[in-house]
């Protein structure tokens, strides 16, 4: 369906409001350091141009591709060279190389100030004074900090953000109404960004085939009553949507996502019985709802897999005829029968099956060779089951904060070269998996836990990629999409690591810690814990616990003291000495 003007086509499909929002997100994800006002100006210029193309698709430049139009616009930014350095060199390239160049310069961990939440009254006043600017600012701030945030989903977050302010700024107790909603949006937003980050990393590092395999497994679990052909169609469409969003083609992505939601709802009878409620919602809510919909019930009396994939003499013939289709069918059949498995486990099983067929179909007696392939699955299934059982027991025993600390110690010992903020951020997230997943019954634990772990370990990979410091991290991050988590789990203490010099400054604290939120105070303590392990990697659990207990008592005491700063100075010196003695430094 070729259109004379791509920009006019997307403007008409999406409507002005969504068009402007998506262009703002696209620009903020590319030029992450530019001030808000500059982006708004660029967006307004693009919007005015789009309107001229809607009026006359043959008008000058209206036939240009979106990449050309947007790239030209970004390259008009006067301060490009001084703000972004070598990114400015992208502007010397032609499309599609120019867009690829911009994509390569997206920064997953941009050097931007932490977002500080103003007082509720200040926010409500700003919301009432200029609602449109207030909401655009939200899109801009999230997009520039999360350059791979799933754009159509960000529109959904913005809609909820607006609804929260609309409701709560009229409430008797504005703060009680608004703050929990904002906390929820922040936490969900971080999780959504991390999930999309994994999808984009999969596409970029491992290619379309790997992403499609992931999608077959996930959609087959979710829609076990759907035919293989139906699942294949959904996978193809979903892959296109995510390829576009990860590639910066946000208008196409949002448009295609809307089309996919429409198709799913029009065909829900042949897809899933769980879609009814989702399909009654407006577009943004509908798409979100479909993405989160619970698994449909498995069809009754599904036959054993063995007949078609092990028992049949035609296995090698079917495999040779269309390898990816046959493997896709295997994955579909296995996944729809196993909503209790994580997607990455299903992919490991499919990979094992593929490797076996590659070897056996070239053997003298193929059937004899692949007959026992399902036996090879047993250890692959048991490994995550045991890991989750052990870690959930530890989580239940310790609670979230202390469980995070156990993971901090574990991961710092595995990869001590990684920066302390990265280790803290990733371990805190890994620890939250306990709270999220361990409460589930056995049948739901693995898909929850292992797929969550994959998302957060990808975060470690992405942050590490920016400044690689550990060969072990690089190895676990690049060898395989599905074996990342087992690779990290298998790492032992890094015996080659030379402990960091002890620096008392790292363990010097001031009265400002007393005014921090509980979460921020935890992060301070966890930062100190990582540094301790980096100084003394062979420290025992008991030694570290003793030091952390001392630290907690020190903070508690000095925050209650009349002269806090003096207490922090005097007790701080003794804390350092006591810690050094406890750790034998």
């Amino acid at each position: 369906d070729a259109h004379k003007s791509e920009v006019a086509h997307r403007f008409k499909d999406l409507g002005e409001e969504n068009f402007k929002a998506l262009v703002l997100i696209a620009f903020a994800q590319y030029l992450q350091q530019c001030p808000f006002e500059d982006h708004v100006k660029l967006v307004n210029e693009v919007t005015e141009f789009a309107k001229t193309c809607v009026a006359d698709e043959s008008a000058e430049n209206c036939d240009k591709s979106l990449h050309t139009l947007f790239g030209d616009k970004l390259c008009t930014v006067a301060t490009l060279r001084e703000t972004y350095g070598e990114m400015a060199d992208c502007c010397a390239k032609q499309e599609p190389e120019r867009n690829e160049c911009f994509l390569q310069h997206k920064d997953d961990n941009p050097n931007l100030p932490r977002l500080v939440r103003p007082e509720v009254d200040v926010m409500c006043t700003a919301f009432h004074d200029n609602e449109e600017t207030f909401l655009k600012k939200y899109l801009y701030e999230i997009a520039r900090r999360h350059p791979y945030f799933y754009a159509p989903e960000l529109l959904f977050f913005a809609k909820r953000y607006k609804a929260a302010f609309t409701e709560c700024c009229q409430a008797a107790d504005k703060a009680a109404c608004l703050l929990p909603k904002l906390d929820e949006l922040r936490d969900e937003g971080k999780a959504s960004s991390a999930k999309q980050g994994l999808k984009c990393a999969s596409l970029q590092k491992f290619g379309e085939r790997a992403f499609k395999a992931w999608a077959v497994a996930r959609l087959s679990q979710r829609f076990p009553k759907a035919e293989f052909a139906e699942v294949s169609k959904l996978v193809t469409d979903l892959t296109k949507v995510h390829t576009e969003c990860c590639h910066g083609d946000l208008l196409e992505c949002a448009d295609d996502r809307a089309d996919l939601a429409k198709y799913i709802c029009e065909n829900q009878d042949s897809i899933s019985s769980k879609l009814k409620e989702c399909c009654e919602k407006p577009l943004l809510e509908k798409s979100h709802c479909i993405a989160e919909v619970e698994n449909d019930e498995m069809p009754a009396d599904l036959p054993s897999l063995a007949a078609d994939f092990v028992g049949s003499k035609d296995v090698c013939k079917n495999y040779a005829e269309a390898k990816d289709v046959f493997l896709g069918m295997f994955l579909y059949e296995y996944a729809r029968r196993h909503p209790d498995y994580s997607v990455v486990l299903l992919l490991r099983l499919a990979k094992t099956y593929e490797t076996t067929l590659e070897k056996c179909c070239a053997a003298a007696d193929p059937h004899e060779c692949y007959a026992k392939v399902f036996d090879e699955f047993k250890p692959l299934v048991e490994e995550p089951q045991n890991l989750i059982k052990q870690n959930c027991e530890l989580f239940e025993q310790l609670g979230e904060y202390k469980f995070q600390n156990a993971l901090l110690v574990r991961y710092t010992k595995k990869v001590p070269q990684v920066s302390t903020p990265t280790l803290v951020e990733v371990s805190r997230n890994l620890g939250k998996v306990g709270s999220k997943c361990c409460k589930h019954p056995e049948a739901k634990r693995m898909p929850c836990a292992e797929d969550c772990l994959s998302v957060f370990l990808n975060q470690l990979c992405v942050l590490h990629e920016k400044t690689p410091v550990s060969d072990r991290v690089t190895k676990c991050c690049t060898e395989s999409l599905v074996n990342g988590r087992p690779c990290f789990s298998a790492l032992e203490v890094d015996e080659t690591y030379v402990p960091k010099e002890f620096n008392a400054e790292t363990f010097t604290f001031h009265a400002d810690i007393c005014t921090l939120s509980e979460k921020e105070r935890q992060i301070k303590k966890q930062t100190a814990l990582v540094e301790l392990v980096k100084h003394k990697p062979k420290a025992t659990k008991e030694q570290l616990k003793a030091v952390m207990d001392d630290f907690a008592a020190f903070v508690e005491k000095c925050c209650k003291a009349d002269d806090k700063e003096t207490c922090f100075a005097e007790e701080g010196k003794k804390l350092v000495a006591a810690s050094q003695a406890a750790l034998g430094l």
Epitope: A546, D549, D550, A553, F554, E556, K557, K560, E570, E571, K574, L575, A577, A578, A581, A582
Partner: nanobody
Framework: EVQLVESGGGLVQPGRSLRLSCAAS????????MHWVRQAPGKGLEWVSG????????TYADSVKGRFTISRDNAKNSLYLQMNSLRAEDTALYYC????????????????WGRGTLVTVSS
């Protein structure tokens, strides 16, 4: 106001045991290391033992090592000194003392003293 009240002293025969207690009030007990200090008749002060805020770190004077045991119960705001194999030279007034710090490192800082409890070891 900080109060430290010792109890448990008395007359005891050599080789026997005694347990001293110190009840603390007027401050957050678990925010401080605690000590026992003694003064024998006509002599100067002698530090006996110290215990960190949570009992993780304990130190003793050589003269009492292996015979005396210091402990604390933060829930009861109490400090204890278990004295075994008592000798005539252990005769002294025993003071419960609060440190200024949580920790037992370097030289102790004796900030608040109790009134003392007398221990007499004699046959």
């Amino acid at each position: 106001e900080v109060q430290l009240v010792e109890s448990g002293g008395g007359l005891v025969q050599p080789g026997r045991s005694l347990r001293l207690s110190c009840a603390a009030s007027g401050f957050t007990f678990h925010h401080y290391a605690m000590h026992w200090v003694r003064q024998a008749p006509g002599k100067g002060l002698e530090w006996v033992s110290g215990i960190s805020w949570n009992g993780n770190k304990i130190t003793y004077a050589d003269s009492v090592k292996g015979r005396f045991t210091i402990s604390r119960d933060n829930a009861k705001n109490s400090l204890y000194l278990q004295m075994n194999s008592l000798r005539a030279e252990d005769t002294a007034l025993y003071y419960c003392v609060r440190d200024s710090s949580l920790f037992i490192v370097g030289a102790p800082t004796f900030e608040h003293w109790g009134r003392g409890t007398l221990v007499t070891v004699s046959s």
